[in-house]
């Protein structure tokens, strides 16, 4: 006999990285017929919704009208059909950005390089933080962590065309509170020998520094830009 229902999916719109004082919507998708959804924040009940009519609705939206550091953290949701509750969703890490200061991002030897060259990004922030994050823009939002007193370096190693793209960095005051983003740096990689049509959309990085956020079959159920909790779930682990 089934004791629990399958876990729902949770994601944030427009993004899990939310500028302070901006609004974010947390979506929870369960099953048609669910009579109640609960959103939990850091283990405590945060909001409740009972969709009507339940048989025609399988997703609810929870709102955070005014993002701040108190609202940044881990969210999960559950739903109920009759008296039977679901397993909890994966954790969604909601991050508040645009806190305090703006870091500076630079790249060595420069933004235009030849395939095979070693490239290093430098993120600098003169205020009290020792953790830095480098993000490559794109559907799978790769995040690399680096550490340093006022500056962190992010060696990409020998680059390929897969490394092409726009990068930004953040200073991190804690796991869920990040600085303003740096100005973007666009990396252009030319002269690649390999067949570029076979190059992956995003490069693979050493497991100890990069989270690889692959779109799973779960994600296929939703809009492409909704990365669910996979990005956020892996981001801070």
């Amino acid at each position: 006999q089934q004791q629990t229902l399958p876990k729902p999916f949770i994601w944030a719109e427009p993004h899990f990285m939310v500028p302070k004082e901006k609004q974010v919507t947390i979506c929870c998708q369960g099953n048609y017929g669910a009579v109640e959804y609960q959103l939990h924040f850091e283990g405590s009940l945060f909001a409740v919704d009972r969709p009507k009519p339940p048989e025609r609705i399988n997703k609810v939206q929870f709102y955070i009208p005014d993002m701040n550091s108190r609202m940044a953290g881990q969210y999960s949701c559950i739903y109920r059909v009759g008296e039977l509750w679901s397993e909890p969703s994966n954790l969604l890490d909601l991050v508040v950005t645009e806190m305090y200061d703006t870091p500076t991002l630079s790249v060595h030897p420069g933004p235009e390089v030849i395939s095979g060259e070693k490239v290093t990004f430098y993120c600098r922030l003169d205020t009290a933080t020792s953790m830095f994050l480098l993000l490559k823009e794109g559907r799978s939002s790769h995040v690399q962590r680096g550490y340093g007193k006022v500056q962190a370096e992010f060696p990409l190693g020998p680059v390929t065309t897969a490394h092409r793209g726009t990068y930004r960095c953040f200073g991190s005051y804690n796991n869920h509170a990040w600085s303003f983003p740096s100005e973007p740096v666009k990396l252009l990689v030319t002269g690649d020998i390999e067949n570029t049509s076979l190059a992956p959309e995003d490069p693979t990085f050493p497991a100890d520094t990069w989270g690889t956020y692959l779109l799973t079959t779960e994600t296929g159920l939703q809009k492409d830009h909704a990365l669910w909790d996979h990005t956020a779930q892996n981001l801070l682990r």
Epitope: T25, F46, A47, P51, K52, V60, Q61, Y63, P65, M71
Partner: nanobody, 135 residues
Amino acid sequence: EVQLVESGGGSVQAGGSLRLSCAVSRGSMASTGCMAWFRQTPGKEREAVAIINISGTTRYTDSVKGRFTIAQDSAKNTLTLQMNSLKPEDTGMYYCAATQNPRTVGRGYCTGDYFQVGGGGYSFWGQGTQVTVSS
């Protein structure tokens, strides 16, 4: 900016009753969404004991169900909490709180059967009124 001012707290014997009031000023109830009474007791997190949303739907924490009643008087711009059959464990500081209006947030926010339970989702808070229940 909505301002909330509580009154009606005091000391009472177990089994007695109190009625808390929360006056909404600098704005009106029309500029809020969910309204709630939160209770802060020593050594415990602040919890929502009673919530009423813009549709007039109510929600109570299990420990006060059947004893407490939350109500809004929109004409008087007042939120009330009628507390009957009070118990010593009801002792604590009681705060009135309100969220932003759904018009500024999103359709469905604090309407129908949507309740904001966690205190972090409330934008406006009163200063609190103390309730002491002795055995």
